[in-house]
């Protein structure tokens, strides 16, 4: 059952409850005591396990995967699994900690002596949402661009948004995945109402920037339900 | 920090049911994961539900699968668990909990922001 396949997985020996968030079983790794996250909360103690649901990696942390965590499971359940690190099986390139990047389904080091000058690599883009298979559309993209451990630029090729600087995100843009910036207060934004429709964008957006939701523009209540511009907005 | 205040907890009979109501307000709702947890007496804080942003990802503890169903109104800024078929073993303060929004927020491992609690009491 999902039960135990996550218990075996359970964040032991946290600090004392102090009323913040907490650690959940997608991480095999306990969480280091003491660390305070962006919000300043604590953990609370919990010796059980605490499944996030995903429906895509970028739901999840940037130590995480999304995925079904168990191979014939749920077909309904994704939750946000620990990154896999080096020399580790994978599928897609999110599934591997950052600093990595999947190759012929192994996680290897993305460090710049592995990038040096213009080099060819498979980037898996699953366009549904079982991001656990490999299915979908697979294509090779050539990277033009050396990848550092600078973190991205604007227009700077990605694997996920962790690559990219301070306000912005890994986004599709045609083929490929570039560094966007996330997006401000009054920007158009893409609103999602199918399950899995954000993977046929080959102009993906940025999500709203903090403090921030997509949400229909007030003077589009009375437009049809096609022609409804979401935009940025304020909490 | 995001404020969340959980309603609709009460007494019932068991094989009855209740709907649990939790408003998330504060520095942001972010509209990522809402869950919801219980801790019985003298027991641990366990996992009941959760859905994701997009509502297309549910999962829920084996002991009420089936049961209770977790949904969310992101409009509203509110989260639900119908629970049906109560049993006396559900008794219990059940917290609401917000996700963090992951990396789109900076953070390292996606989490939950926990409420007060509402007391459910099953027992004829």
């Known amino acids: 059952t999902l039960n135990s396949v996550l218990n075996s997985n359970a964040i032991k020996n946290l600090p004392p409850p102090l009323g913040g968030a907490a650690g959940h079983p997608g991480s095999a790794v306990s969480a280091a005591p003491g660390i305070l996250y962006p919000g300043g909360n604590k953990y609370q103690t919990i010796d059980n396990y605490q499944p996030y649901p995903c429906a895509e990696d970028e739901e999840c942390g940037t130590d995480e995967y999304c995925a079904s965590p168990t191979r014939g499971g749920d077909a309904g359940v994704q939750i946000c699994l620990a990154c896999r690190k080096r020399r580790k099986r994978c599928m897609r390139h999110a599934m591997c900690c950052p600093g990595n990047y999947c190759k012929n389904g192994i996680c290897v080091s993305s460090d710049q002596n592995h990038f040096r000058g213009e080099i060819e690599e498979t980037i898996t883009e699953s366009f549904g949402n079982d991001h656990s298979t490999l299915d979908g559309y697979s294509r090779r993209t050539t990277l033009s661009s050396k990848m550092y451990h600078t973190k991205g630029q604007e227009g700077s090729v990605c694997l996920r948004s962790s690559d990219c600087a301070s306000g912005l995100c890994c986004a599709r843009h045609f083929w490929s995945k570039i560094c966007k910036p996330v997006l401000k207060e009054g920007q158009v934004c893409t609103k999602h109402r199918r399950k899995g429709s954000h993977g046929l964008e080959i102009f993906q957006r940025c999500y709203c920037g903090e403090g921030l939701s997509c949400r229909i523009q007030k003077d589009h209540h009375q437009a049809s339900n096609s022609s409804r511009l979401h935009t940025c907005q304020r909490h | 920090e995001v404020q969340l205040v959980e309603s609709g907890g009460g007494l019932v009979q068991p094989g009855g049911s209740l709907r649990l109501s939790c408003a998330a307000s504060g520095h942001t709702f972010r509209g990522y994961a809402m869950g919801w947890f219980r801790q019985a007496p003298g027991k641990e804080r366990e996992f009941v539900a959760a859905?994701?942003?997009?509502?297309?990802?549910?999962v829920y503890a084996d002991s009420v699968k089936g049961r209770f169903t977790i949904s969310a109104d992101n409009s509203k800024n509110t989260a639900y668990l119908q629970m049906n078929s109560l049993k006396p073993e559900d008794t219990a303060v059940y917290y609401c909990?917000?996700?963090?929004?992951?990396?789109?927020?900076?953070?390292?491992?996606?989490?939950?922001?926990w409420g007060q609690g509402t007391l459910v009491t099953v027992s004829s």
């Open positions: 909990a917000a996700g963090n929004g992951g990396r789109a927020y900076g953070y390292s491992r996606a989490r939950y922001e």
């Open positions: 859905i994701n942003r997009s509502g297309s990802s549910t």
